[in-house]
Interface confidence: low
């Protein structure tokens, strides 16, 4: 009735001291290696010559933290990073902050970077639309308060405003081009 | 919309803490930091910590040895306390949201 | 990093142009500015020097760079009756400014 070695399960290390012979209903926990964390019961318990129960551990670290454009991160970067690891981030100049500076390795996902926005409020080339261009010469940065306006492709009709604004680093909404109805 | 109720006493006792507690609403503790601030008539607005989305926190130097902020993001609180508290703390003492870069968009009503 | 307002106290009659100046002990990245009234807590007003705060009007403006930082309103009124206060967090601890108390003629 009693029990021999102790079964072995992945990234599971047994605790306390190993014996070569566990009586009838003696516990043995298992504790994680590092970057698991225990999933369900920890133990395992001697019963009729067969241990019973089934420790799991679950990988719960996270790789790669999140890519945040015009920004760097300023904490020690790590191939695999445990849970509850946190890494901080900096924008690079001249864009701002927007959001929480840090993010947090939380059981296998990362919790939401932050963004880094033009502070001054520039803008990146209209958005194009279908059938339509603008009428001007597209620029690579437009600063804010600047508007361009859009022109529609022969037989297709103008629906909402022609001229968009530059507003906090945003376009305001384009029109569309539509095909008229032909009856 | 997003808001922060802050709740605590309003008066200490010399030499006591002081504890506030700041519930959120309409934003996750989870993605956002949160602020302590305190204003006087003597010193002006004065920051005291955050605490981050992911837990940490970062205490102005003149008050580390006697502040500590956490929080439970299951619960939508931010816990402040101050310990040691003299006649000049009294001040009216604020939570308020990270907006970036340590600045703060929404505040809380105020403890005096 | 100390920043010192000027000035602390000032009266304006509506329409007339105001500027605020903040100066600060050493350089920093950026300033953001707060209006607080009597008995309300303060309120995000102009961050990151330059960009409006949601439902700022238009009035208002900021600039600078360096070590010195302006809040200008192109034309007071009366609802513009305000403390304002500056605030940099190029370096911790984040610090503010003493404060501008506006008030109307």
């Known amino acids: 009735t009693d029990c021999l070695s102790l079964p072995s399960f992945e990234n599971a290390i047994p605790m306390g001291e190993k014996k070569d012979v566990y009586k009838a209903g003696e516990q043995v926990t298992y504790t994680c290696a590092t970057y698991y964390k225990m999933d369900g019961a920890s133990n395992v318990t001697c019963i009729n010559s067969r241990w019973t129960g089934r420790p799991t551990c679950r990988d719960t670290s996270c790789v790669n933290p999140p890519t945040v454009q015009n920004a760097y991160i300023v904490s020690r970067q790590m191939s695999k990073y445990p849970s509850g690891e946190r890494v901080r981030y900096q924008c690079r100049s001249p864009y701002e902050m927007f959001g929480d500076e840090e993010v947090m390795c939380l059981n296998g996902n990362w919790t939401e970077p932050p963004q880094c926005k033009d502070s001054t409020g520039k803008c990146g080339p209209p958005p194009p639309i279908d059938n339509g261009d603008i009428t001007s010469f597209p620029l690579s940065v437009y600063a804010p308060a600047s508007s361009v306006e859009y022109q529609c492709q022969n037989l297709y009709q103008l629906e909402g405003n022609k001229r968009i604004t530059c507003r906090n680093g945003q376009w305001s909404e384009p029109p569309k081009c539509l095909h008229p109805c032909v009856i | 919309q997003v808001q922060l109720q802050q709740s605590g006493p309003g008066l200490v006792q010399p030499s006591q803490s002081l504890s506030i507690t700041c519930t959120v609403s309409d934003f996750s503790l989870a993605r956002y930091g949160v602020h302590w601030i305190r204003q006087s008539p003597g010193k002006g607005l004065e920051w005291l910590g955050v605490?981050?989305?992911?837990?940490?926190?970062d205490y102005n130097a003149a008050f580390i040895s006697r502040l500590n902020i956490n929080k439970d993001n299951s619960k939508s609180q931010v816990f402040f306390k101050m310990n040691s508290l003299q006649a000049n703390d009294t001040a009216i003492y604020y939570c308020?949201?990270?907006?970036?870069?340590?600045?703060?968009?929404?505040w809380g009503q105020g403890t005096s | 990093i100390v920043l010192s307002q000027s000035p602390t106290f000032l009266s304006a009659s509506p329409g007339e142009k105001v500027t605020v100046t903040c100066r600060a002990s050493s350089s920093v990245k950026y300033m953001h500015w707060y209006q607080q009234k009597p008995g309300a807590s303060p309120k995000p007003w102009i961050f990151a020097t330059s960009n409006l705060a949601s439902g700022v009007p238009a009035r208002f403006s900021g600039s600078g760079s360096g070590t010195s930082y302006s809040l200008t309103i192109s034309r007071v009124e009366a609802e513009d009756a305000a403390t304002y206060y500056c605030?940099?967090?190029?370096?911790?601890?984040?610090?503010f400014g003493n404060g501008t108390k506006l008030e109307l003629k």
């Open positions: 605490i981050w989305s992911g837990g940490t926190a």
């Open positions: 308020a949201r990270n907006f970036g870069n340590y600045a703060v968009d929404y």
């Open positions: 605030q940099q967090w190029s370096i911790i601890p984040p610090t």
